[in-house]
């Protein structure tokens, strides 16, 4: 509600807007009849400086001239970049009481002139798009500064166009509207940018380009795919593209890849024939263009058409395994299982497996279709039998993949020698063996089958299996492997007509067990104790269990106990001692071993034998 | 249907001012390109300057460059075309044009593009 200047005028010298380090003189007067009213020398004038709306600084003792009770000139010097605010105020020292009265003010802005702009690029997005620039402005000038942007061409015409910078926009791009179009192609554009501000001008050097330097396609559109003849490996891709157009780059990929197919195409014409596509696999397709062959810029890519190609027939060969077992004397059981085909190889959704058993010499043939991995049948024991299985898509059939059922381990000969198991880490084991000794016909392959030694394993869970060349000792075995859990494993030498095995039990890390055997029952036989027991729960095992101990001694004695070591087998579950006394009456129990160690003592079972004892 | 009016020719003396007026009347011309034409005694009608509503694009030929400065005040649907330095080849009838879009360099400064035209007014420059 002050009426600001009313009082006197602020003037700046040399000017209202400075370069950074530049000194300036404000002067303060006030007009004629104004001031302190009784005492026109009493007038005071003092300078306040303001930053932000902050009172900084009173400038008393910056005072040049003074004309005592007219005016004051002061220096003021340093100024930080930016604004700064100056108020001149009147002070009547004779009334101490009255705050100092408003005579006027000055904004002096402090800069510096701008820099040339620097790194001028033009671009026109698409044949029907217009041309804009962008420039480096160079070191912010803390001014209101003008640019103007300046396109000289053919037609001896030239366009501009202006914007401003200062302490709220940036101005480093316009957009000229204008279209240049092919008929420009080989006409030279020159442009350039000017700046200027109160402290100064300048000019970047003249930029030069050409059409093709300038105009970025745009990214194709209305992409697709057409496969012939329902192909899984062809198809043409087709897209539509700006009529200048006369290179494409096409990228492809299986959408879990992470790497893409690349293809140049001169004068596509928005057509191309891919001819090695995967079938049954989902793709992510994109294209680029170019309006030159050599010179201009690749358009960004199109959005991405995902498809997936047709199925064709697998191919491959199916990995077979089975297991053998006698039902009664002139039957036997044949399970058939075989491992998934991969993604490659099915090329499609696998509906059905075709499983054929033929006895080769009656001519006798079982088949059947089935959707899962394994098949079960009865079947004579007598004769010569043979599998085939293959796998089926809505294209057609993979090659049968055959294999003669054998007695895998009928032949003492052929029993692979020196079968060791290591845990190599957390999930797998090594197996390793030497060949058969006496072998009377050529091993053709050896498979390493293994299974989790748990109840019901055998009834429950198909095996796992490995192929391995007849010219290798070694398998690591890593499917399924759990740690802290014992596994069956067997390696098997087949010939053309005949198998040999070998077992050992493995697992790939080890504790030792939770708990020992249970003691069920201590009976007297023929001056001999026979000790049975339950096996520890297979989730207490934790790992393979090489040996179970028996402990005894006398129920009050001090001494430590004796033991007996029995070597592990799943199948037992009772052993005869015979080193004790008749009429004592004995403490027993029993602990189990794993490469990592005892387990705690199982339960306490007293007893006393009665008979003579040896 | 867009009609131009041009005003603000006459006499002036070599190195003096003129300001000419083209007021449009009929729709916005928001997305138009507004031009100013010349023709001498015969001679062919040559492009002069033109302004870009949308854009605020300025076009000039290279014979008025930093002399001329043409401008344009939308809410009065009227383009200015000031003329400083005039020199005696300047001397013509100026014509007051209008297109509408695409607007390409090709076509800017061509007459065939423009499809409203005003009634002319002449500028004489003595020396």
């Known amino acids: 509600n002050i009426d600001v200047c009313k009082l006197g005028t602020v003037t700046v010298q040399p000017a209202p807007v400075i370069p950074l380090g530049s000194a300036a003189n404000i002067s303060c007067s006030l007009n004629p009849k104004q001031g302190c009213s009784h005492y026109p020398s009493s007038n005071e004038l003092i300078l306040l400086k303001f930053v932000n709306d902050v009172l900084v600084e009173n400038l008393h003792g910056k005072k040049v001239h003074d004309h005592t009770g007219h005016s004051s000139t002061f220096q003021v010097t340093n100024l930080s970049l930016g604004m700064t605010l100056f108020v001149c105020k009147l002070n009547c020292s004779n009334s101490q009481k009255k705050p100092p009265v408003p005579v006027c003010g000055v904004e002096i802005s402090v800069g510096v002139a701008p820099e040339p702009p620097q790194n001028i690029s033009c671009v026109q997005e698409g044949e029907n798009g217009t041309v804009a620039c962008s420039w480096n402005s160079g070191k912010v000038t803390y001014l209101k500064t003008n640019y103007t942007l300046q396109l000289s061409g053919p037609n001896n015409l030239t366009c501009q166009k202006q914007c401003f910078s200062d302490n709220r926009q940036n101005c480093n791009r316009l957009d000229l509207g204008i279209n240049l179009s092919p008929d420009l192609a080989e006409s030279r554009f020159i442009v350039r940018v000017t700046a200027i501000n109160d402290l100064g001008n300048s000019s970047s050097l003249p930029h030069t380009f050409t059409f093709l330097d300038i105009v970025i396609p745009l990214p194709p559109w209305d992409i697709r795919i057409n496969f012939l003849n329902a192909s899984g490996s062809r198809g043409t891709l087709q897209w539509e593209d700006e009529g200048q157009v006369v290179l494409n780059q096409l990228r492809y990929q299986p959408l879990n890849s992470t790497s893409w197919n690349m293809v140049n195409a001169t004068n596509a014409k928005g057509k191309y024939d891919l001819r090695d596509l995967r079938p049954f696999t989902e793709y992510e397709f994109q294209i680029s263009s170019k309006l030159h062959l050599s010179g201009g810029s690749w358009s960004n890519w199109s959005e991405s058409l995902r498809t997936r190609t047709p199925e064709e027939e697998p191919v491959g060969i199916l990995d077979i395994w089975y297991m053998k077992q006698d039902i009664d004397y002139d039957r036997q059981q044949i399970s058939l299982f075989w491992k998934s085909l991969n993604p490659s190889e099915a090329r499609g959704k696998i509906l059905h497996y075709q499983v054929t058993l033929q006895e080769v010499t009656k001519k006798t043939t079982l088949q059947n279709t089935t959707r899962h991995t394994s098949w079960t049948r009865v079947i004579p024991r007598t004769g010569a039998w043979t599998a085939s299985v293959s796998a089926a898509n809505s294209k057609g059939a993979s090659a049968p993949t055959h294999i003669n059922i054998v007695d895998l381990c009928g032949t003492g000969l052929l029993a692979p020698h020196q079968v060791s198991a290591k845990s190599e880490n957390m999930d797998n084991i090594l197996v390793t063996w030497q060949p058969p000794k006496k072998a009377d016909s050529a091993v053709r392959e050896y498979i390493v089958e293994w299974r989790a030694l748990q109840p019901g394993s055998i009834t429950k869970f198909p095996p796992h299996w490995l192929r391995i060349p007849p010219d290798n000792m070694s398998a690591l075995i890593s499917e399924n492997i759990k740690p802290y859990i014992c596994y069956e494993i067997r390696v098997h030498a087949l010939s053309e007509s005949q198998g040999g095995c070998s077992s050992i039990r493995g697992d790939s890390k080890h504790k030792a067990p939770v708990s020992g055997p249970h003691i069920t029952a201590i009976t007297e036989k023929k001056e001999r104790l026979f000790i049975s027991w339950t096996h520890i729960p297979f989730p207490e095992q934790r790992g393979c269990i090489l040996h179970y101990r028996i402990y005894w001694k006398e129920r009050d004695s001090t001494a430590q106990p004796e033991l007996c070591e029995i070597q592990y087998r799943r199948s037992q579950n009772s052993h005869p001692i015979s080193s004790l006394q008749p009429r004592v009456t004995y403490v027993l129990w029993m602990t189990a071993v794993t490469a990592a160690g005892e387990s705690p003592q199982g339960n306490e079972r007293e007893f006393c034998p009665q008979g003579k004892a040896n | 249907q867009v009609q131009l009016q041009e005003s603000g020719g006459g006499l002036v003396q070599a190195g003096g001012s003129l300001r000419l007026s083209c007021a449009a009347s009929g729709r916005t011309l928001s997305n138009s390109v507004m031009g100013w034409f010349r023709q001498a005694p015969g001679k062919e009608r040559e492009f002069v300057a033109a302004l870009m509503w949308s854009a605020g694009s300025e076009f000039y030929t290279d014979s008025v460059k930093g002399r001329f400065s043409i401008s344009g005040d939308g809410a009065k649907n009227t383009v200015y075309l000031q003329m400083n330095s005039l020199k005696a080849e300047d001397t013509a009838v100026y014509y007051c044009?209008?297109?509408?879009?695409?607007?390409?360099?090709?076509?800017?400064?061509?007459?065939?593009?423009?499809?409203?035209w005003g009634q002319g007014t002449q500028v004489t420059v003595s020396s």
């Open positions: 044009a209008a297109k509408n879009p695409p607007h390409r360099w090709s076509d800017i400064g061509k007459s065939p593009h423009y499809e409203y």
